[in-house]
Amino acid sequence: QSGPLPKPSLQALPSSLVPLEKPVTLRCQGPPGVDLYRLEKLSSSRYQDQAVLFIPAMKRSLAGRYRCSYQNGSLWSLPSDQLELVATGVFAKPSLSAQPGPAVSSGGDVTLQCQTRYGFDQFALYKEGDPAPYKNPERWYRASFPIITVTAAHSGTYRCYSFSSRDPYLWSAPSDPLELVVTGTSVTPSRLPTEPPSPVAEFSEATAELTVSFTNEVFTTETSRSITASPKESDSPAGPARQYYTKGN
């Protein structure tokens, strides 16, 4: 045996975004003839020696990062990529809106705004029909992302989630769907790009805006955040209301 055994794959079916009390199955897949699978929940010191974990009803405590490996003889494989299992519906849904409106001409600009009454500092935007249906929705770690130079590829149904960086696997319920209609030439819908994480401050009422510029199918993002304190909010799970204004680079 030269080198380590190749890593298995780990996926959540039907999705890694799981509403509370709904079922989900985690499946670790290695090559044929594996002697032993080990499925681990990270940062909890717990594991199961099986390839499949069926969760009949999602709980907050089951949200988190998972990883699996397998053993052949005395050799262990490289670990799978980590799977982030997210519990949704933990908090009330945010609202998603389009500015100036959900109908936009091809080449025009539109801003998607995800607004929450809680003190969340993280937002996730999900576009239906993503070609990787079991992948987490894209997470946008900064609050301002207008879509510049819209193309027909941006047409579709969007939902957003909000959550706190303190509990990154406990998400709100999804917003009501927003149908973005782009008038102009027909283009095959494409996925939204992924933004790498960057820490941001907490706040009590926030607006997340999505901005994506496309140039020869390469995208950039421009970000800013405008936050208004809302002293009357006393049920914010992220703590007391504070006022911040931050602007991305």
Epitope: L36, R38, E40, K41, L42, S43, S44, S45, R46, Y47, Q48, D49, L53, R65, R67, S69, Q71, W76, P79
Partner: antibody, heavy 123, light 111 residues
Amino acid sequence: QVQLVESGGGLVKPGGSLRLSCAASGFSFGDYYVSWIRQAPGKGLEWVSAIGGSGSAVQYAESVKGRFTISRDNAKNSLYLQMNSLRAEDTAVYYCARHYREFRWHYYYFDYWGQGTLVTVSS
Amino acid sequence: QSVLTQPPSVSGAPGQRVTISCTGSSSNIGAGYDVHWYQQLPGTAPKLLIYGNSNRPSGVPDRFSGSKSGTSASLAITGLQAEDEADYYCQSHDLGAHVWVFGGGTKLTVL
């Protein structure tokens, strides 16, 4: 209450063999991972081997691989460690320890330990 | 040589606070595995003191606390008492070969 009692230790010559036993009581033995952990005189703890509840999942430290064999008999609530080709550096107190378990999950720590049995390898 | 690194000894006067560090690597503590602590009183078997970085089993006084950050962890003991004199071991798991790993142990002396 949970109890783990080791036995079988003693003096053995280098190259010799010894079989340690650990008698478990006070819990459903077959549901738990158990390990052997040793401590050389005046030294620290060293994990030796672990075995899953059914006996099919076994793991060994590199220092004993190929020489030691862990096994269990759930009907007898017993854990075993067959030690062959013993060396002077295997001299230690050998503890059996239970891994914590909750619902379907096993945990990577030891919640109960036996009192240990001393193995001395010397000519 | 142990996979996890602890100071060989620490000491403190009764009533004082002492901390014991435990340093690992990206394949154990830094790989998402928790750190657990055991107390071994002279002539006895080890006893679980802290599990899951910072949790105390029932019966363990709240003078004992644990924390973890990155690839290291620490055990803090406040209000030192004579009966705390013992060896303390940290333990975690290593992803490379899925083995259980210990620190070399720290002898606590109460002055």
